[in-house]
């Protein structure tokens, strides 16, 4: 039986979980969390991390709210790990150009850009 | 006249460059730099721009190499002020929520999840 | 663990396509420290390189194939694929795939290809 | 493009030191990686980065690298140790990968 759920799978029940539990979440009206202007979300993951710390310590647990928490601390496990995994293979430049190029490929096609 | 160019020609610019100059880049034979395991390349940009720091100690400087360099720490210098801007602005709980949920919709969807 | 398992016909027509396979499973092809390469070695000879491809698509040929050589990567089946053309009994060989990082690391087994009508 | 040469073939007795050469143009400036290869079986990398040994691999294999010539050198030689050999270097000029024409090492005995 395997003791992990997919991340895939995980990010999905999440969702779920985000939706059912939105009500309870925006209870506190005077709560204010820091809110990336932006939609690269990637390069953002510590401060949405920070702000998910904040609605946490700030809501009600008990039942599947607590799952939804839960969830997001897996989440960012995943993403922590894919962090440390930026600097693991040292590789000759030839390698690290195609990785360059493919970075500022999708830079250009796939960010959003404000000049 | 604009005195900056587009961040988005820039990276055209730089693509171009980085093609043009690739065999004087490649020319350490022994030289390795750390090249991420992902396709998730936003998580990876401390270490991208250390290689293009380390790439560039490494290659003797003139002519249009000189502007790649330059083009690659003004893409640095992009990203950068991306970054300041995660943490920016202070939102309700609601509009976090949004974000959030778009977050994990784009993490579904678009990221290269291995499990 | 990566293993790589090459698969495709082991008889080709003279002047046909050859065309191979190598599934990657115990890692992701979309591994940004990893080219994905195909060596032949013909009875009784050195290796010899053919080519290699990135994740993203870009592609290295030996200029004595390229004429006719393509290599393609589908990272949704974690798959990269050869496709050798106008083939001669010259072409006859075993055909390994392989990750290749600073040097080889993971080999297939190899197939035997026989050109031959 | 690149060209490694190895010589056909090398003898050696059980015991002894065997020497096998990899001649390329200045190619003591690049990396030389080094695989060994039984009959029937996919080559194994037995020396990387001029003389870098990865884990599993005796000590007994060792390597070399500088002006024109790379060296593999195996100690104490066994009867397992017949295989071929083919150095490999990458010519950066190109990013094309060149192999050796590839070594057959006997065991005398």
């Known amino acids: 039986i395997p003791t992990e759920i997919p991340t895939s799978a995980l990010v999905k029940e999440t969702l779920a979980l985000l939706s059912t539990h939105r009500t309870l979440l925006i209870a506190n009206e005077t709560l204010r969390i820091p809110v990336p202007v932006h939609k690269n979300h990637q390069l953002c993951t510590e401060e949405i991390f920070q702000g998910i710390g904040t609605l946490e310590s700030q809501t009600v647990q008990g039942g599947t709210v607590e799952r939804l928490f839960k969830n997001l601390s897996l989440i960012k496990k995943y993403i922590d790990g894919q962090k440390k995994k930026c600097g693991e293979e040292r590789r000759r430049v030839n390698q690290f150009l195609d990785y360059l190029q493919e970075f500022l490929g999708v830079m250009n096609t796939e960010w959003i850009i404000e000049s | 006249i604009p005195t900056e160019i587009p961040t988005s020609a820039l990276v055209k610019e730089t693509l171009a460059l980085l093609s043009t100059h690739r065999t004087l880049l490649i020319a350490n034979e022994t030289l390795r730099i750390p090249v991420p395991v992902h396709k998730n390349h936003q998580l990876c940009t401390e270490e991208i721009f250390q290689g293009i720091g380390t790439l560039e100690s490494q290659t003797v400087q003139g002519g249009t190499v000189e502007r790649l360099f330059k083009n690659l720490s003004l893409i640095k210098k992009y990203i950068d002020g991306q970054k300041k801007k995660c943490g920016e602005e202070r939102r309700r709980v609601n509009q976090f929520l949004d974000y959030l949920q778009e977050f994990l919709g784009v993490m579904n969807t678009e990221w290269i999840i291995e499990s | 663990q990566v293993q790589l398992q090459e698969s495709g016909p082991g008889l080709v027509k003279p002047s046909q396509t050859l065309s191979l396979t190598c599934t990657v499973s115990g890692g992701s092809i979309s591994n940004g420290g990893y080219y994905w390469s195909w060596i032949r070695q013909h009875p009784g000879k050195g290796l010899e390189w053919i080519g290699y491809i990135y994740y993203s698509g870009s592609t290295y040929y030996n200029p004595s194939l390229k004429s006719r050589v393509t290599i393609s990567v589908d990272t949704s089946k974690n798959q990269f694929s050869l496709k050798l053309s106008s083939v001669t009994a010259a072409d006859t060989a075993v055909y390994y795939c392989?990750?290749?990082?600073?040097?080889?690391?993971?080999w297939g087994q190899g197939t035997l290809v026989t050109v031959s009508s | 493009s690149y060209v490694l040469t190895q010589p056909p073939s090398v003898s050696v007795a059980p015991g002894q030191t065997a020497r096998i050469t990899c001649g390329g143009n200045n190619i003591g400036s690049k990396a030389v990686y080094w695989y060994q290869q039984k009959p029937g079986q996919a080559p194994v990398l037995v020396v990387h980065d001029d003389s870098d040994r990865p884990s599993g691999i005796p000590e007994r294999f060792s390597g070399s690298n500088s002006g024109n010539t790379a060296t593999l050198t195996i100690s104490r030689v066994e009867v397992g140790d017949e295989a071929d050999y083919s150095c490999q270097v990458w010519d950066s000029s190109s990013d094309h990968v060149v192999f050796g024409g590839g070594t057959k090492l006997t065991v005398l005995g």
């Open positions: 392989a990750s290749l990082g600073n040097w080889f690391d993971y």
